[in-house]
């Protein structure tokens, strides 16, 4: 950009005419105080562009800065701007008039600021005073800008002398604002809502009293604006909240809601966003389920836990063998459903000191008006093995029969073993396991029955010993996942007159 005449400062006579030309490689224009004055733009023969600004019959009011800029800045190379400053000394005009908002100067922290009192004549001497004190302050003055320095919270005026007349400027008010770092938080009453329900989002600021809230939300795209409510929050100093409320949500209201908070004075801001989902209907979805068969151990407590996601909050029922369960007064059963997050829930059935009678078929139902899920499983109560009976008999055929009866859940396994050296059995000599083999001098028969009312298995195992020629220790051992139990009997030959 090239300005002719080149400046950078001109002092014009009042009522004179002055012509400024700006040229550039693209269309250019003049700006004065953010306004575009009347000017003549042209394209030159050499392919350059120019704009001519003619100032006619100038007055003190034409004093100020003028910028030449590219008309449509289309990139960084066209963002250049050239500045010149014009003075038109006008004895009838003291200080240049100011917009009322420019008389209030807000300062954050201890930063330099400018009191922008300007005169039309660069030769005038200008002084700055506290309004109530006549002594001039030692602050550097720039005729094009004003007094720049660090100012306290006070009222100030500028003074100059035009001829023999002392002229005062308007009063300038300086305010220090305690602008701490903005602490913004955004939360919603619900981040998931059904269409027709309301959306309420609260944006809260801590530590600032002068703030502007600006919301962006999906409805803005269609030009439907929502008026937020801004108000103080009591109890904590400097806490202001802005609430955005949409009474009847639509599916198109799904999306990101952003609250931007800026401090008016220096545009220092922060923003927080939250996502809202508007759904057509509510839902219930299982996240963590249980197996088809769940195991509990007799007399131990067992927690059965189901995790699900739902909106709105569903009702939850637990049933056993199709009968609804409730918290028992005796504390044998505890039911609870609690929130893990806004839409995630965990429902627990706690069986305290499990009894055999608590085995059976269980169902958990989670439901609301829009949806439901259910989960069914069988609860198996494991019972430790007990050997209930170990008896011996002598049938007429000369065999010896030993019968072992026991119970447990899950189904116990039976192991028979013998030991011939009574003195060393069973501590010093391991018993010899017996199998069901025809080669051996024994025969094994095992029957298993499931007792429905007791929810456990009964095992009856019979060992037939074809012939016993010396005393024999016989052990019956029952085992399942809960442990084992065993009993022993000593078998003596028929010929011996006694049994131990």
């Amino acid at each position: 950009l090239v300005i002719t005449p080149p400046g950078p400062e001109f002092v014009l006579n009042i009522s004179s005419t002055f012509v400024l030309t700006c040229s550039g490689s693209a269309p250019v224009m003049w700006e004065q105080m953010s306004q575009v004055p009347w000017q003549e733009a042209a394209m030159n023969q050499d392919g350059t562009f120019s704009s001519v600004l003619t100032l006619t019959n100038v007055t003190g009011g034409d004093t100020g800065e003028y910028f030449c800029v590219y008309n449509n800045s289309l990139g960084p190379e066209l963002s250049e701007r050239k500045r010149i400053y014009i003075f038109v000394p006008d004895p009838t005009m003291g200080f240049l008039p100011m917009d009322s908002e420019d008389l209030f100067i807000f300062v954050t922290d201890v930063t330099e600021t400018t009191i922008p009192c300007r005169v039309t004549d660069p030769q005038l001497e200008v002084t700055l005073h506290e309004k109530k004190v006549d002594i001039p302050l030692h602050v550097p003055y720039d005729h094009q800008r004003g007094f720049t320095g660090t100012f306290e919270d006070k009222t100030y005026i500028c003074k100059t002398t035009i001829g023999d007349r002392e002229v005062d400027s308007d009063t300038y008010y300086v305010y220090s604002l305690q602008v701490s770092s903005i602490n913004v938080s955004v939360n919603a009453v619900q981040t998931v809502v059904r269409q027709g329900e309301s959306i309420t989002i609260r944006c809260i600021v801590m530590g600032n009293d002068v703030v502007n809230f600006q919301w962006t939300y999906p409805r803005m795209k269609s030009g439907r604006l929502v008026e937020p409510v801004t108000d103080y929050l009591f109890g904590v100093p400097s806490r202001i909240g802005s609430i955005l409320h949409i009474p009847t949500a639509e599916l198109s209201d799904s999306g990101t809601y952003t609250c931007n908070v800026s401090v008016s004075v220096n545009d220092h801001g922060d923003e927080k966003a939250i996502n809202i989902s508007v759904i057509e209907n509510g839902y219930v979805r299982l996240l963590e389920t249980l197996g088809d068969v769940e195991i509990a151990e007799l007399h131990r407590s067992r927690t059965l836990r189901v995790v699900f996601e739902a909106y709105p909050m569903p009702s939850v029922l637990w049933l056993k063998d199709n009968r609804t369960l409730g918290d028992s007064g005796a504390g044998e059963l505890v039911l609870s459903t609690r929130n893990m997050s806004e839409t995630r829930y965990v429902s627990e059935l706690i069986l305290v000191r499990v009894k055999v009678s608590e085995a059976g078929y269980y169902t958990m139902r989670a439901f609301h008006e829009d949806d439901e899920v259910q989960l069914s499983f069988k609860l198996q109560v494991n019972v430790p093995v007990r050997v209930l009976e170990l008896s011996e008999s002598h049938p007429a055929n000369g065999e010896q029969t030993i019968r072992c009866r026991g119970r447990g859940m899950p189904q116990p396994n039976v192991t028979w073993s013998t030991c011939r050296d009574l003195k060393r059995c069973p501590r010093k000599l391991s018993p010899t396991p017996l199998g069901n083999s025809s080669k051996e001098e024994s025969q094994l028969e095992t029957n298993v029955t499931f007792w429905e009312e007791d929810q456990e298995y009964e095992v009856v195992s019979t060992l037939r010993l074809r012939h016993v020629d010396q005393p024999l220790s016989v052990r019956c051992m029952l085992q399942n996942s809960m442990g084992g139990d065993s009993q022993e009997v000593t078998v003596v030959p028929h010929s011996l007159p006694f049994k131990v």
Partner: antibody, heavy 114, light 101 residues
């Protein structure tokens, strides 16, 4: 239309407890702070108490320690309870909307006298 | 809060009532007669409720709030209270009696 209707005023005995209720309608109650302002006969306005949208509360110096303000968003009501009543609590009590007050109720008269 | 105890004006004139000593946020409340409910004419410094005539305006400069009634009318005769609110609550001025001559 936005309306605020106060109830619960009337003759009260010194040392007793005053319970005022304000029923709001015509706006999204949960989005606004609510409060109470009173005016003694021949006197100016005096702010009594406020409750914000998050449930935070604040009280005027004349009632601090004696007053409790609460709200029920479901019922769109705000309640003021004032204990240990004194003759100087005699006033017209107005229900108000927002901490800065953009709407007033018609008021309910409270007279504390034995 | 400090506000003048009374001001008077002829119909059609512009009236300014100032209030100082507040913090960040001024409101103006009109009460036409003792015992009648106040009406908010300006809140949050310069916001005017939709049912309040446009001749009422508010501004704030520094720590002073100003209520301006441009073209005052007979029905504007009332006591005007200023209030200043923040997160610790609200305080009121003693009231300014506006007399329309």
């Amino acid at each position: 239309a936005v309306t605020l209707d106060e109830s619960g005023g009337g003759l009260q005995t010194p040392g007793g407890t005053l319970s005022l209720v304000c029923k709001a309608s015509g706006f999204t109650f949960s989005s606004y702070a609510m409060g109470w302002v009173r005016q003694a006969p021949g006197k100016g306005l005096e702010w009594v108490a406020g409750i914000d949208t998050a449930g935070g509360t604040a009280y005027g110096p004349a009632v601090k320690g004696r007053a409790t303000i609460s709200r029920d968003n479901g019922q769109s009501t705000v309640r003021l309870q004032l204990n240990n009543l004194r003759a100087e609590d005699t006033a017209t009590y107005y229900c108000t909307r927002s901490s800065y007050i953009d709407t007033w109720g018609h008021g309910t008269e409270v007279i504390v006298s034995s | 809060l400090t506000q003048p105890s009374s001001v008077s004006a002829n119909p059609g004139e512009t009236v300014k009532i100032t209030c100082s000593g507040g913090t960040y946020n001024y409101g103006w409340y009109q009460q036409k007669s003792p015992g009648s409910a106040p009406v908010t004419v300006i809140y949050w410094n310069d916001k005017r409720p939709s049912d309040i005539p446009s001749r009422f305006s508010g501004s704030k400069s520094g720590s002073t709030g100003t209520l301006t009634i441009t073209g005052v009318q007979a029905e504007d005769e009332a006591v005007y209270y200023c209030g200043s609110s923040d997160s610790s609550g609200l305080i009121f001025g003693a009231g300014t009696t506006l007399t329309v001559l």
